[in-house]
Amino acid sequence: VPTATLVRVVGTELVIPCNVSDYDGPSEQNFDWSFSSLGSSFVELASTWEVGFPAQLYQERLQRGEILLRRTANDAVELHIKNVQPSDQGHYKCSTPSTDATVQGNYEDTVQVKVLADSLHVGPSARPPPSLSLREGEPFELRCTAASASPLHTHLALLWEVHRGPARRSVLALTHEGRFHPGLGYEQRYHSGDVRLDTVGSDAYRLSVSRALSADQGSYRCIVSEWIAEQGNWQEIQEKAVEVATVVIQPSVLRAAVPKNVSVAEGKELDLTCNITTDRADDVRPEVTWSFSRMPDSTLPGSRVLARLDRDSLVHSSPHVALSHVDARSYHLLVRDVSKENSGYYYCHVSLWAPGHNRSWHKVAEAVSSPAGVGVTWLEPDYQVYLNASKVPGFADDPTELACRVVDTKSGEANVRFTVSWYYRMNRRSDNVVTSELLAVMDGDWTLKYGERSKQRAQDGDFIFSKEHTDTFNFRIQRTTEEDRGNYYCVVSAWTKQRNNSWVKSKDVFSKPVNIFWALEDSVLVVKARQPKPFFAAGNTFEMTCKVSSKNIKSPRYSVLIMAEKPVGDLSSPNETKYIISLDQDSVVKLENWTDASRVDGVVLEKVQEDEFRYRMYQTQVSDAGLYRCMVTAWSPVRGSLWREAATSLSNPIEIDFQTSGPIFNASVHSDTPSVIRGDLIKLFCIITVEGAALDPDDMAFDVSWFAVHSFGLDKAPVLLSSLDRKGIVTTSRRDWKSDLSLERVSVLEFLLQVHGSEDQDFGNYYCSVTPWVKSPTGSWQKEAEIH
């Protein structure tokens, strides 16, 4: 048990620890406690082992929980006596009844306990505690009385504590050993003397705060503890606390007022006064800042400081600005030689600073005035703006030119310059609002910036913005498109030169809009074909002219294509259209699908006039029969050498129809050897018959071709075997097997195909195809329709 006498005050709790060491018995030890008042024998008090151990006197106190044993470890226990009384003064013995099997050492120990009367008095006893209301920076002091009439030599310790809501903070303590101990956060204020603790008389303890901070608000308690020294160790024997006062820190009243609206002429002085109202008359110092903003909100990022008077009365200001004070409550801002850029909102920002510990300062109040709206009036330039179109487009791709003229009454002023902005607005098609589109804008330094609509075309040189005279701005569209139709207007801005040589826009004047428009009628293209010599026979020259007329096509040039629609033998099939010859807009001729090698120069197409074209076909043949048309395309020039297709039209047809009662040819195939064996000679005859007009054999000629569908490829197309043209020339196709072919004219109307040394591959179906040629009365050969 503790060696020193334990001293306690009536009503407090007595705790005596007891522990046993260096034993061999069970790890968890049992403890018995007994008590002896001065001079009497020991009486059983409490036991961890035997329930019936305590004397009757203590049984009741044990049951009430006034006395209890608390085990703190296997080898340690604490005796707790709550609400200790003078009768509890005496000796307390702790013993371990079952430590070891054999006795080694001491198994009991005794400690003396003294119980003193409560002789500690702590005040004040005022209920409820008073409330102190003060302002930041003001001083306050709180007092607490504490005295002890103890017969023993005791020391008092005192702690000042502040409570704010649930938070408890130590302010300053005086320990029982006479040392001052500032709480966390109070160290600096204690060392600087701002927070002090001293005694007044024999029993009063004073907490002094020389300059209150907002953090000092709260309920202050004085906690006094009494200490006694026993064998060199100090013991706290009791503690008492008292609520001393509630400190309320009132916020300082501070207002800053400036005039609401001020108007000042350009070039004059702006004088603004900031009047301060405050309830502080002590040693606070003001800091005054004037700031400027374009917006009526001083918190916006655009706000800038113009001048500042610091708490040492030093002025910090920008050029042309002065700050002065007539008295401690009135501060002037003077802005010299004002210009338009000084228009805006002015604020007066005031801070009050109170001196703190260690030559430091802390802000006790802050206020910002409502804005002073300042308008700078100036003599604005007086001018008019006129817009007219010097070039109006009649068609797409024509140029447009607009001139924007400034008529200025005082254009000679050196401190005014003019710039232009060009705008486009689409023609309204309905009541919808049509917004203007910026084409170009010129800054005060005459830098030109393009709008989205015009950026690319300006870079391509299609939009040209210029200033050709001192009073005229020009806008030219090199090639006006349909999308460019609409209203154009210009805005001329006047710029005024400032003090710092910068230019500030002072006025905008809008021109009346000019409407760029042309009728967008559909392009019309009409082509008329005619045949100058309507009657002719086969072998004659066919001539056709095409006359073109157009409307709403700018500077047209024409390209011409001659096409023929030929009837196909099968009535259910559509007519076949053939492109014969063409002439482009640059008069370059091209043969299209003219494949007759014998009549390469047989067709001619030429330009007779700008709007007239002539087609000739020499040595016409019966096979040339059909409907002939001119297909004409009109082209408009675009951007120099480029062309745009404006319209295409087809002429009426001119028919070539040979009314003949000529012969009708038929062809048939006959074989003497329809069935052969490999190696035999195959003989096949193509026999032509003629019906109708009798013809001289010299006036007939034939192109004959033989085809076969071989038995090994019945699903394939016929294969050309051999042909004999009207001039008697034989052509034979290449073969992959050994048999040979021969083709000969055996009579006027018979042609013989022979297969020598036939093989399996030669078996199959054979056809002959005949194209007759007949000599016309003019002596030209006419090709007839092919027969099979």
């Epitope: 310790a157 702690l159 809501g165 649930p166 938070a167 408890r168 903070r169 130590s170 303590a173 320990t175 050993e177 101990h181 709480g183 966390l184 956060g185 160290e187 600096q188 901070l213 907002s214 953090a215 100090w234």
Partner: antibody
Framework: EVQLEESGPELKKPGETVKISCKAS????????MHWVKQAPGKGLKWMGW????????TYADDFKGRFAVSLETSASTAYLQINNLKNEDTATYFC????????????WGQGTSVTVSS | DIVITQSTPSFSVSPGDRVTIICKAS??????LAWYQQKPGNAPRLLIS???SLETGVPSRFSGSGSGKDYALSITSLQTEDVATYYC?????????FGGGTKLEIK
């Protein structure tokens, strides 16, 4: 629920600077102070200093004066610890801890930020 | 500076044991003593403040005692989840200081 959320681990070279953040939530930031505690690998806890969140005033233990700076961003309820001119011996986990209502005892702690200083 | 000594750096314990960890201050710290529990990889957790006040949510098997310079943390019936390092900490005088820690290990 009171929470202190510290920034992520940092790997730095000697001579560099590190700035650790500690974001508070679940209570009024300016009602409690903020403390910083260092724990070197395998070692015990060492109190570095504290900041008064109401006034912004800070106090440092002697071993942490000079290169160490504690600051606040009150609007974001965040405290910062900046260590300049890092040395190898600054390798540690740094905890922020709230100074609670009872005499500023450190009642809630951040999860810690590991700072490794190595060349 | 106030020096805080935790004389026993480590203890080997068994579940169910009663454990007392002792902490001594170099000068009177007026009950401004806190006990923290720290598990590996975690932040410290406040168990006791003001030498004896148990924090909300801390099991009642933990208790604190002492005054002046001598303080103790007791765990009446040790649970396996109590295996950790325990630090005592004085917050009476700046700079605030910690004990070196006492590590509890299972036997």
């Amino acid at each position: 629920e009171v929470q202190l959320e510290e920034s992520g681990p940092e790997l730095k070279k000697p001579g560099e600077t590190v700035k650790i953040s500690c974001k508070a939530s679940g209570y009024t930031f300016t009602d409690s102070s903020m403390h910083w505690v260092k724990q070197a690998p395998g070692k015990g806890l060492k109190w570095m200093g504290w900041i008064n969140t109401e006034t912004g005033e800070s106090t440092y233990a002697d071993d942490f004066k000079g290169r160490f700076a504690v600051s606040l961003e009150t609007s974001a309820s965040t405290a910062y610890l900046q260590i300049n001119n890092l040395k190898n011996e600054d390798t540690a986990t740094y905890f922020c801890a709230r100074g609670g209502p009872n005499y500023y005892v450190m009642d809630y702690w951040g999860q810690g930020t590991s700072v490794t200083v190595s060349s | 500076d106030i020096v805080i000594t935790q004389s026993t750096p480590s203890f080997s314990v068994s579940p169910g044991d009663r454990v007392t960890i002792i902490c001594k201050a170099s000068e009177d710290i007026y009950n401004r003593l806190a006990w923290y529990q720290q598990k590996p990889g975690n932040a410290p957790r406040l168990l006791i403040s003001g030498a004896t006040s148990l924090e909300t949510g801390v099991p009642s098997r933990f208790s604190g005692s002492g005054s002046g310079k001598d303080y103790a943390l007791s765990i009446t019936s040790l649970q396996t989840e109590d295996v950790a390092t325990y630090y005592c900490h004085q917050y009476w005088s700046t700079p605030w200081t910690f004990g070196g820690g006492t590590k509890l290990e299972i036997k």
